[in-house]
Interface confidence: medium
């Protein structure tokens, strides 16, 4: 409640997160023209990426382009990219939609289509749909520990969300354990009224709101966080221009004295931790 006699000041905060969990991934792997079932384990180092600010990312799905090398190849025949002669291909031209620089030659992409040859990471990335269901759909069971230190400099008061009495094996629950700072990712989505399995396919952005409403008067002291969750990206993926949340990164290696890479288009959930609130004291 608003105590008008109190001097209020906004919270200053720092956040640190730690994600835990293991995912088993089964996917189709093609080697030498033979497609078989591949099996791999993903741990924290495989699916999380350090982000700036109060955010962390968990990869839930991916599309790989393996064995890419910097050379010449036909560009992917997306709409409007096909050619029938060299006249259509402009030497040195770099189309923003393309993955490379045109050499000026029109070359076969496959038996039926020709596209402009490019100097690029080849073979160029195909325009593939994100796998459905998501490859790391079991990320729903991962947990994240959120450490939140707060400070009210005007009142010379510092505290944190983790208390010495807290049990390291607890899991946040709105009713049974609202002060536990270990959150199951699936529960965050449930609390926000979202379907984790669905969002995991294309990715998305989820907000974790930590609200500190602190009464710092000694006779009625209270300063504990309240957690709430809401989705921050546009959930109407059909209508939005670029649905979900994804980015590309690469793993580099050498083979036959040539640098190669595996390009990974990673889809996943970016969790933004939004800390706000006030501290009031007479």
């Amino acid at each position: 409640s608003d105590k008008l006699y109190q001097r209020k000041e906004p919270v200053i905060s720092s956040v640190h997160t730690k994600v835990k969990g293991i995912a088993e991934v089964t996917e189709n792997v093609t080697e030498g023209g033979v497609t078989k079932l591949g099996h791999s384990i993903f741990d924290t180092a495989d699916y999380t990426f350090p982000l700036q600010g109060n955010s962390f990312f968990v990869m839930t799905n991916y599309v790989k382009s393996e064995g890419q090398v910097q050379t010449l190849c036909p560009e992917y025949p997306r709409r409007g990219a096909q050619c029938s002669s060299d006249r259509r291909c402009k030497k040195g031209w770099m189309d923003p939609q393309s993955k490379g620089i045109q050499t000026g030659r029109c070359v076969p992409y496959d038996k039926t289509r020709k596209t402009c040859e490019v100097s690029a990471w080849c073979p160029t990335e195909e325009e593939k749909e994100a796998p459905r269901p998501a490859l790391l759909r079991s990320a729903e069971n991962f947990t994240v520990l959120i450490k939140n230190n707060i400070h009210f400099p005007g009142h010379n008061y510092t505290t944190r969300n983790i208390l010495p009495t807290m049990n390291g094996s607890c899991t946040f629950h709105k009713t049974w354990d609202p002060q536990c700072s270990i959150f199951r990712l699936g529960d965050i989505f449930q609390e926000a009224g979202e379907n984790f399995t669905e969002v995991a396919v294309q990715g998305g952005i989820m907000g974790i709101e930590i609200y500190w409403d602190c009464n710092l008067d000694s006779w009625s002291h209270h300063c504990r966080p309240r957690y709430s969750f809401r989705r921050l990206d546009d959930k109407n993926t059909d209508e939005s221009f670029v649905p979900g949340y994804n980015f590309r990164y690469a793993k580099y290696y050498k083979e036959n004295n040539v640098e190669k890479r595996t390009l990974i288009k990673a889809f996943g959930i970016r969790f933004d931790i939004l800390v706000f609130g006030t501290g009031g004291k007479f």
Partner: nanobody, 120 residues
Framework: EVQLVESGGGLVQPGGSLRLSCVVS????????MGWYRQAPGKQRELVAT???????NYADSVKGRFTIGRDNAKNTVYLQMNSLKPADTAVYYC??????????????WGRGTQVTVSS
């Protein structure tokens, strides 16, 4: 100046084998496609086999299963292993490379050729 020097040609009996080599020297940004073409007397030059910088190979239908192309990027060399040779394989074999030059596009380079004769 870029130079391509072929070696390994010669006279061989039908069913025999030969291994052609082509060494590339000179200053280049990078070598992209490397390959072998051949020209029999009175005929046009035709593709035998190519290998990309990513080690993707492509063969003419007439040599599939008999010829194998490979490259060694550290030595700037392309090889052609020819097995089960037939009289129809008799030709001058030319080494070819594509090299991409920043700002100038693709340059095509050819060797002088090495003679392969298959005869009993």
């Amino acid at each position: 100046e870029v130079q391509l020097v072929e070696s390994g040609g010669g006279l061989v009996q039908p069913g025999g084998s030969l291994r052609l080599s082509c060494v590339v020297s000179g200053s280049m940004y990078r070598i992209d496609n490397m390959g072998w073409y051949r020209q029999a007397p009175g005929k046009q030059r035709e593709l035998v086999a190519t290998v990309t910088r990513g080690d993707i190979t492509n063969y003419a239908d007439s040599v599939k299963g008999r010829f194998t192309i490979g490259r060694d990027n550290a030595k700037n060399t392309v090889y052609l292993q020819m097995n089960s040779l037939k009289p129809a394989d008799t030709a001058v074999y030319y080494c070819n490379i594509d090299s991409y030059i920043i700002g100038a596009g693709v340059r095509d380079y050819w060797g002088r050729g090495t003679q392969v004769t298959v005869s009993s």
